[in-house]
Amino acid sequence: DTEIKVNPPQDFEIVDPGYLGYLYLQWQPPLSLDHFKECTVEYELKYRNIGSETWKTIITKNLHYKDGFDLNKGIEAKIHTLLPWQCTNGSEVQSSWAETTYWISPQGIPETKVQDMDCVYYNWQYLLCSWKPGIGVLLDTNYNLFYWYEGLDHALQCVDYIKADGQNIGCRFPYLEASDYKDFYICVNGSSENKPIRSSYFTFQLQNIVKPLPPVYLTFTRESSCEIKLKWSIPLGPIPARCFDYEIEIREDDTTLVTATVENETYTLKTTNETRQLCFVVRSKVNIYCSDDGIWSEWSDKQCWEGEDLSKKTLLR
């Protein structure tokens, strides 16, 4: 009985198509597959950013795979050939590993890259990113932002920069069609006549950085002698009602402060007949049904009722 062996895939490489972190891993079939013509060969691919503790593992019948990486760090990958038992008289056979790495040669010292990068997707409509210049860079340094997400043919440069003292310190993005629920890649690089500038790479999903507008049309409705219903409306814009959580702050007679988090556009408050003044504010955030994270809106305008009779049927302001 001769031991069945199979070679690793050939020409294993990581290809950067210029998508700012979305890379192609590709390979060719192993040499000497003639013995296994009737076989469906599979490949086990393991890959990670250098420094990560865990490998991501996939098995595929293809000769390529695509995924996103952090280009601030290097990437390492390895692959081997798998033959299922049907090909080999009942034993599983795997080749040795073929390995490859990829990294972008860094220019400039780390301190020259942008600091405090912050991106907010306002009301699920307008993306704005801002940053501070690198530490110790001269005023002639300018930063440029590029972005890509699946659906764009190539990476695009920002066309509407926010400037301070002649330097780009942010970007107002155009309308981003079909850009949520997928990885959004950004590179901020820079140029200076004096010294090279380190590039920075960022990846996020837009639905996770949404800052909604605050709720509107706050009203009171007396439900019973000891209950008042607080109501408000969802903010204008594309975010559906099912995507909101709300936080309410209620103040009675300038003393009692009640804070509550609710999923609907109403909150029922227990009151006493002695209550003379009632004020509340509400803010909104995208909930876990529509995103993994989010940013609280600003507080709404304060809505107050004050007067002699809190038992009126409807209290509007």
Epitope: T40, I58, K61, N62
Partner: antibody
Framework: EVQLLESGGGLVQPGGSLRLSCAAS????????MSWVRQAPGKGLEWVSA????????YYADSVKGRFTISRDNSKNTLYLQMNSLRAEDTAVYYC??????WGAGAFDYWGQGTLVTVSS | DIQMTQSPSTLSASVGDRVTITCRAS??????LAWYQQKPGKAPKLLIY???SLESGVPSRFSGSGSGTEFTLTISSLQPDDFATYYC??????????FGQGTKVEIK
């Protein structure tokens, strides 16, 4: 005749553990890869985990990684799923399934009858 | 992950009808697709593998076609025993193995 018979399901509190078993007969158990697939009440099918015939390689869905462990005892013709840190969303009928062809997963040509796992306080 | 999308979600048909269910993959999966039939309270049953190969013992009125991202399951003449839920499944690249959300074939 190929048969797969699951057992070990039941009611468990959130955070608890269960071990499912799948007794196989009617085929050479040590050869094919095997998988666990689950189905929450009124929902579709969700693949959970796979193991190669030798048991040398295992694969998991992200939703169970780090909490569930698949294993097999080829001398006993039995597949296992150890489920720890159970959550309400793990409530489902759990099926073991035999892989028709392939290294770790593929089309599933035989399925067990399923065992119900209910995670509730 | 490769997403599998079936259409329609529900299909009303009569005995004798020709029924077609579509499955779309979010990226090419070559021909690495299976179709299953499931009846209430029962385990799924393999009908088609490798997109178009009929599993042993499955009636010839069932057929599969397609490659790449578009696949169809066809029942040439619907029989009373065929009212069930049907699932597609890709096994091109994993983990995870992914299933479509299911198509329920009900009596019109």
């Amino acid at each position: 005749e190929v048969q797969l018979l699951e057992s070990g399901g039941g009611l468990v509190q959130p955070g608890g553990s269960l071990r499912l078993s799948c007794a196989a007969s009617g085929f050479t158990f040590k050869l094919p890869a095997m998988s666990w697939v689950r189905q929450a009440p009124g929902k579709g099918l969700e693949w959970v985990s796979a193991i190669t015939g030798s048991g040398g390689s295992t694969y998991y869905a992200d939703s169970v990684k780090g909490r569930f462990t698949i294993s097999r005892d080829n001398s006993k013709n039995t597949l296992y799923l150890q489920m720890n840190s159970l959550r309400a969303e793990d409530t489902a009928v759990y099926y073991c399934a035999k892989v028709r062809y392939g290294w770790g997963a593929g089309a599933f040509d035989y399925w067990g009858q399923g065992t119900l796992v209910t995670v509730s306080s | 992950d490769i997403q599998m999308t079936q259409s329609p979600s529900t299909l009303s048909a009569s005995v004798g009808d020709r029924v077609t269910i579509t499955c779309r993959a979010s990226q090419s999966i070559s021909s690495w697709l299976a179709w299953y039939q499931q009846k209430p309270g029962k385990a799924p049953k393999l009908l088609i593998y490798d997109a178009s190969s009929l599993e042993s013992g499955v009636p010839s009125r069932f057929s599969g076609s397609g490659s790449g991202t578009e696949f169809t399951l066809t029942i040439s003449s619907l029989q009373p025993d065929d009212f069930a839920t049907y699932y597609c499944q890709q096994y091109d690249t994993y983990p995870p193995i992914t299933f479509g959300q299911g198509t329920k074939v009900e009596i019109k």
